[in-house]
């Protein structure tokens, strides 16, 4: 007789998640030599033991507190990249500077990135059925809790001028309950940081509007300013070429751009 | 065959200065991490400094950081570590050795004495 | 005081097997591979294991290294003479950025 499972309102886990994480883990480790002697397949032991076995809607921070050990690798706490509904971008960015980052550029990030995953209370099993959506069925599943984590953390190490990536085509360019608004935002710590900068990429190439004063980035200037942290914004009217300059600064139409 | 030369070691007084050499053979050098590390009379291996390839990134045991410097000249196929501010406690033989690629220690040199002595 | 813990000693007689223990944590051993090495006085030391149980070729199957949470071991069976030597397993520590050794084992090899 096959034994009930949980339906869930979410996708299952991605399939072959443990050979992707650990296939990414040690892809990780040979693009990032300074991770040279990381272990990947204690690291999968750690991620695994976060999840498995554990019903999915009461996962905790203390659950991934083994893999966060891991978590100390030294990304340069003055070159951090935050982004909100933009990810991509913030990721074609690092790509170029290379000497900035994103939380997918550090090792949990990276192994995370994209990827679904749950198990299932008292079995050794990853539910590949379905997962539980953070609306539709609870907040404290394993992937909500793991980047509610890692995003912590990532905010906490931040220091003197952070950058922020914020998609300026959405209703609410800065969104309280994304997790930079939830999460990264509350999280700064004023001790360190002296500046937010916020890049607000404009979507329609014929867009010239200040979207810096757009109320959610004013909700968002007051919100740090609160916490004893300058803000300053700047717009992106063409993110195409943003990247090209970035690419190529010596470029004489790059003036203008950051 | 990889061959790493040590040089440089000898008698200095506290307080004094000192640097280290080692000559590498056999290997692309560039490529690769590089580290000192020492053995006091009768204690135990210690490590002391590393050097990565490409853009150098530095790393420092506690016990040296500000009073050490590793540095490498890939031109010339060499490795250093320049001792400033040496104490009694930094006597010892330092070893020069190549990292592989997971971060092991693969290749070591026979040593260079260095001690500390009024 | 050495941040991964070894015993100072270990023996056995001509062809026996001897297992050093190496205790680290989570900062260490834990998360990173562990590493062995062969020093006899007067030499350069020698890797003998790395990534927790590969070997470096030359180096013979009667070393072999294991790795569980924050413990490693060295085994070596069928004990020979040119095998008294000491030990050392080290690893990096992302507490410290940089690696740690034990404090060595002395291996005897009885008459």
């Known amino acids: 007789v096959p034994r009930w499972r949980q339906q869930w309102s979410g996708p299952g886990t991605t399939k072959r998640f443990p050979e992707t994480v650990l296939a990414r883990c040690v892809k990780y480790t040979e693009i990032h030599p300074e991770m040279r002697h990381v272990d990947c397949q204690s690291v999968w032991d750690a991620f695994k033991g976060a999840f498995i076995s554990k019903h999915p809607c009461n996962i905790t921070e203390e659950d991934y507190q083994p893999l966060m050990k891991l978590g100390t690798q030294t990304v340069p706490c003055n070159k951090i990249l935050l982004w909100s509904r933009i990810k991509d971008l913030a990721h074609q960015f690092t790509q170029v500077q290379r000497d900035m980052f994103t939380l997918e550029d550090t090792l949990l990030g990276y192994l995370a990135d994209d990827l679904t995953w749950c198990g299932e209370f008292n079995t050794s099993k990853i539910n590949y059925q379905s997962c539980p959506d953070w609306r539709k069925d609870c907040s404290n599943n394993p992937v909500s809790v793991f980047w509610k984590t890692v995003s912590r953390r990532f905010a906490e190490a931040a220091c003197d001028v952070v950058h922020v990536m914020l998609n300026g085509s959405r209703s609410k360019i800065f969104d309280k309950n994304s997790t930079f608004g939830s999460v990264e935002v509350h999280n700064l710590q004023p001790e360190k940081v002296q500046t937010l900068e916020a890049w607000v990429i404009h979507g329609g190439r014929e867009d010239s509007r200040d979207l810096c004063q757009d109320p959610t980035i004013k909700e968002l200037e007051s919100i740090i300013s609160k916490r004893n942290i300058q803000f300053s914004c700047k717009n992106i009217y063409r993110p195409d070429k943003f990247l090209q300059c970035v690419k190529n600064p010596e470029d004489s139409s790059c003036t203008s751009e950051i | 065959q990889v061959q790493l030369v040590e040089s440089g070691g000898g008698l200095v007084k506290p307080g004094g200065s000192l640097r280290l050499s080692c000559a590498a053979s056999?290997?692309?050098?560039?490529?690769?991490?590089m580290s000192w590390i020492r053995q006091a009379p009768g204690k135990g291996l210690e490590w002391v400094a590393s050097?990565?390839?490409?853009?150098?990134?530095?790393y420092y045991a506690d016990s040296v950081r500000g009073r050490f410097t590793i540095s490498r000249d890939n031109a010339k196929n060499s490795l250093y570590l320049q001792m400033n501010s040496l104490r009694a406690e930094d006597t010892a033989v330092y070893y020069c050795?190549?990292?592989?690629?997971?971060?092991?220690?693969?290749?070591w040199g026979q040593g260079t004495l260095v001690t500390v002595s009024s | 005081q050495s941040v991964l813990t070894q015993p100072p000693s270990a023996s056995g007689t001509s062809g026996q097997r001897v297992t050093i223990s190496c205790s680290g944590s989570s900062s260490n051993i834990g998360f990173h591979f562990v590493y062995w090495y062969q020093h006899l006085p007067g030499t350069a030391p020698k890797l003998l294991i790395y990534k927790n149980n590969q070997r470096p070729s030359g180096v013979p199957d009667r070393f072999s290294g294991s790795k569980s949470g924050n413990s490693a071991s060295l085994a070596i069976s069928g004990l020979r003479s040119e095998d008294e030597a000491d030990y050392y397993c080290?690893?990096?520590?992302?507490?410290?950025?940089?690696?740690?050794f034990g404090s060595g084992t002395k291996v005897t090899v009885l008459g």
């Open positions: 056999g290997f692309t050098f560039s490529d690769d991490y």
């Open positions: 050795a190549r990292e592989g690629w997971s971060g092991e220690f693969t290749d």
């Open positions: 080290a690893a990096w520590d992302d507490s410290l950025s940089g690696y740690v």
């Open positions: 050097v990565s390839s490409g853009r150098p990134t530095t």
